[in-house]
Amino acid sequence: HTAAQDNCTCPTNKMTVCSPDGPGGRCQCRALGSGMAVDCSTLTSKCLLLKARMSAPKNARTLVRPSEHALVDNDGLYDPDCDPEGRFKARQCNQTSVCWCVNSVGVRRTDKGDLSLRCDELVRTHHILIDLRHRPTAGAFNHSDLDAELRRLFRERYRLHPKFVAAVHYEQPTIQIELRQNTSQKAAGDVDIGDAAYYFERDIKGESLFQGRGGLDLRVRGEPLQVERTLIYYLDEIPPKFSMKRLT
C-alpha cells in the first residue's frame, strides 16, 4: 500500500494530510501546500517537501575538494513551483517577478532575472558531496566501520540503492559522503540522490521528516556519531551559469 492502513498515516512524510478516500477506502495522503498525492512507500520529492514546509506554520588528504562548479544552497528556503511529478520546475519566480533557474535539487544555478528569463531544461544534479564535522569522540572512528554504517543508513533509512553511494571519506573530524547518480543510471522507482540528501540533512538537524519515527541515532560500533556542522555541495551535469560579478 501507499500509506499505513491501520491509522492512515504516511510513514515517509509527516508533512501530509491522509484520509481513507482512496480506491476501495484505501488510505491516501496528500502533501501539505501542494495537495499532491504522494507515494508513502518511498521518499517524497524535495520540491513537495519544501512547498509543504513553506505552507506549514512558522516555527594525503583523502577529503574531496569541491569542484569550482559546485553549488551550495545559500538562498535557503523558498516556496517552489513543482511539476505534476513533484519535480522542481526549471524556472522559479518569487512574488515580485524575480526569476532564476534551478537544478534538480532546487538550488539556484543562474543569476536572478525577470520574467523574460528562460530556463530551457531542468539540469540534473548528478553528484552531491555531503561534508560533515562530528563532535569530539573518545577516539577517531574506524573508517571502514563508519563507511559501512553510513552506507547502511542510506540503504535502509532512505532506500537509496547502494550503487549511488560512491564513496565515504574520513579525516577526523570531517566526514564526506559522495552520492552520484547520472540520468542514465536512475531507473524508475530509484530514490533520487537529491531527495535522499535532503532527508539526511533534515535528520542531521533533528528535523526528521519520517512519521512517528524517532530522531536519527547514528552509531558506529555503539559509539554515537554526532554531527555539529553540515555543508552540502551540488554538482550539475551542465556547469551553472553565473556572471563574473558573482565570482569575484
Epitope: R133, R135, P136, T137, A138, G139, Q172, P173, D217, R219, R221, G222, E223, P224, Q226, E228
Partner: antibody, heavy 123, light 109 residues
C-alpha cells in the same frame, strides 16, 4: 524532569574500595553520556570519570588505574568503583549527565547534576 | 595537562551586566568547548547555566548566555540579580578527560 540520585557514600577506610551508584530518571538514559565529578572540602570541582552512551570511558588523572565506571541501561544506573582509597579521595561525589551521547568532550556538555553523596576516607 | 584560566572574583551592582571569561580549553580540530556551572554554597549541587558553549538548559533564565571567541568563552549575565551570587566554574574538553577552572566568585553588591 531529569533527576539523578546518588548512593553509596559514607565513611570508608584507606586502602579499601568504594562503589557509588547513580540512578537516572526523566530522560532516555541509554542515549546520554554519564559521569562523576567530585569536590573535596573547600576545593573546586574535579572530573573523576565518564562513560559514553556507547560505553567508551574516560578517567581523571587522580583516579586513573584505580577507578572503573560502568553503566546498566536496563536499570538506568551508572556505577563508579574506586579502589585503593586514599584520604585525598574524601569529597562530595556528584553524578552528572551530558547533553550528548559522546564522552570525550564530556565536562563541557554537562546539563544536569545530582545532589551529591559525601565520601569520607579515614581510619 | 591543560589548565583553565578564569578570574578569581568579579563583582557587580544589581541590574548591571557581568562577563566572566574562561580560556585554556582543549582544541578539537580548531573548535573549543566550554560549559559554565553555578554553585551557590560549598557542598551544594552545582547547576548548569551554559553547556556546549552557548546552550542554556530550559530552567535557566535568559539573562545567562555564553559566547566563544577563538579559544576563550565568556559567560554573560545581563541584568545581574542578588540571587546570581555564587561561584561559577567553567569546564572544558581535554582529549580523554575533562577539566574545570578554579572558579570565579561573583559578588552582587
Amino acid at each position: 524532569a531529569v533527576t539523578l540520585d546518588e548512593s553509596g557514600g559514607g565513611l570508608q577506610t584507606p586502602g579499601g574500595a568504594l562503589s557509588l551508584v547513580c540512578k537516572g530518571s526523566g530522560f532516555t538514559f541509554s542515549s546520554y553520556a554519564m559521569g562523576w565529578v567530585r569536590q573535596a572540602p573547600g576545593k573546586g570541582l574535579e572530573y573523576v570519570a565518564a562513560i559514553s552512551s556507547g560505553s567508551s570511558t574516560g578517567y581523571g588523572a587522580a583516579v586513573k588505574g584505580r577507578a572503573t565506571i560502568s553503566r546498566d541501561t536496563g536499570q538506568s544506573t551508572v556505577r563508579l568503583q574506586l579502589n585503593n582509597l586514599r584520604a585525598e579521595d574524601t569529597a562530595t561525589y556528584y553524578c552528572a549527565k551530558s547533553g550528548y551521547g559522546g564522552s570525550a568532550s564530556y565536562v563541557s556538555d554537562i546539563d544536569a547534576w545530582g545532589h551529591g553523596t559525601e565520601v569520607i576516607v579515614s581510619s | 595537562a591543560l589548565a583553565l584560566t578564569q578570574p578569581s572574583s568579579v563583582s557587580a551592582n544589581p541590574g548591571e551586566t557581568v562577563e566572566i571569561t574562561c580560556s585554556g580549553g582543549g582544541d578539537y580540530y580548531g573548535t573549543y568547548y566550554y560549559g559554565w556551572y553555578q554553585q551557590k554554597a560549598p557542598g551544594s549541587a552545582p547547576v548548569t547555566v551554559i553547556y556546549d558553549n552557548t546552550k542554556r538548559p530550559s530552567n535557566i533564565p535568559s539573562r545567562f548566555s555564553g559566547s566563544t571567541s577563538g579559544s576563550t568563552n565568556t559567560l554573560t549575565i545581563t541584568g545581574v540579580q542578588a540571587d546570581d551570587e555564587a561561584v561559577y566554574y567553567c569546564g572544558s574538553y581535554d582529549s580523554s578527560a575533562g577539566i574545570f577552572g578554579a572558579g570565579t566568585t561573583l559578588t552582587v553588591l
